[in-house]
Amino acid sequence: CDLPQTHSLGNRRALILLAQMGRISPFSCLKDRHDFGFPQEEFDGNQFQKAQAISVLHEMIQQTFNLFSTKDSSATWEQSLLEKFSTELNQQLNDMEACVIQEVGVEETPLMNVDSILAVKKYFQRITLYLTEKKYSPCAWEVVRAEIMRSFSLSKIFQERLRRKE
């Protein structure tokens, strides 16, 4: 399963789409910056087996997909870009699911790293709470867009390390 290679390209396409989605000048949003507590340690360890690593990445993509599929998101972003972004994420999710099924026969370790997946879930809960508290303002969405771009970039490093391990 050559997921890291294909996923890395998909990740890059998703990042480009995210970058294009900006609607307002981020310079007006500086005071809305927020510490979402990206679970960096979940993407630092080399202890993961491949299937476990993929399951953590899958959770991150799934949560991003959920976040950008809300009606509040649809009201904020340009529709055609949002659709392309969602399609890209959906493709990545499908690739990952197929890859995990392939890996299960190869590895004897548990399929999922429950603690890591929970950490990713809680991270996205903090993002959703922030948006709610900020009443889904344009600046709040701009801060979240920047945060998701950063988390995608950090997970990309994780994927590259995973590819080197193969």
């Epitope: 500086l30 005071k31 701009e142 801060v143 945060e147």
Partner: antibody
């Protein structure tokens, strides 16, 4: 290794134009903003303005608005600061520094070495 | 614009002394404050960000505190390499603004 490398010292006459540069390496250039800071001889730090290299959006300090132009060329990971007509009072050390944008990360964590601009007739 | 006022503007201290520099903002900036150290002929160096977070590679003798309008940089035990000028800077809103600097000299 993250680096911001600035162009060399310049000696100019009043009324001349000038463009100094700041080249980033060792990180994703479009993921960070680049700010410019002036330090006149024996004085403190003054923020001039900032650019988002991903789309060349800029913001200026009111003190420098209309006096300088900040630009960037993301294809060569370089930001610029330029004057169309220099004055003697522009004599200073100019620093570029990277800023994390809207991310919760250290501000101005890496700085260029500085470009000394001397304007004298 | 948000004005940043540092005090004192200069101070004399000895190696081993505890040194405190204060910075006051003209309006609340939450915790959006950074501290920099600058030595003659060198670029500024980030010490503390978001009021109290120690930048990677900076010795633990440096610490920052405060929120709202009043902030403090503390050097718990001054070392010979700490003699320099220190600047605070607000990163709450544009235009970004620096304090006028505090020069720490050898007594």
């Amino acid at each position: 290794e993250v680096q911001l490398v600035q162009s060399g010292a310049e000696v100019k006459k009043p009324g001349e134009s000038l463009k100094i540069s700041c080249k980033g390496s060792g990180y994703s250039f479009t993921s960070y903003w680049i700010g410019w800071v002036r330090q006149m001889p024996g004085k403190g730090l003054e923020w001039m303005g900032i650019i988002d290299p991903s789309d060349s959006d800029t913001a200026y300090s009111p003190s420098f608005q209309g006096q300088v132009t900040i630009s960037a060329d993301k294809s060569i990971s370089t930001a610029y600061l330029q004057w169309s007509s220099l004055k003697a009072s522009d004599t200073a050390m100019y620093y570029c520094a990277r800023h994390p944008g809207l991310n919760w990360a250290p501000d101005f964590d890496y700085w260029g070495q500085g470009t000394l601009v001397t304007v004298s007739s | 614009d948000i004005q940043m006022t540092q005090s004192p503007s200069s101070l004399s201290a000895s190696v081993g002394d505890r040194v405190t520099i204060t910075c006051r903002a003209s309006q609340s900036i939450d915790g959006a404050l950074n501290w920099y150290q600058q030595k003659p002929g060198k670029a500024p160096k980030l010490l503390i960000y978001f009021a109290s977070s120690l930048q990677s590679g900076v010795p633990s003798r440096f610490s920052g505190s405060g929120s709202g309008t009043d902030f403090t940089l503390t050097i718990s035990s001054l070392q010979p390499e700490d003699f320099a000028t220190y600047y605070c800077q607000q990163s709450f809103d544009f235009p970004l603004t620096f304090g006028q600097g505090t020069k720490v000299e050898i007594k």
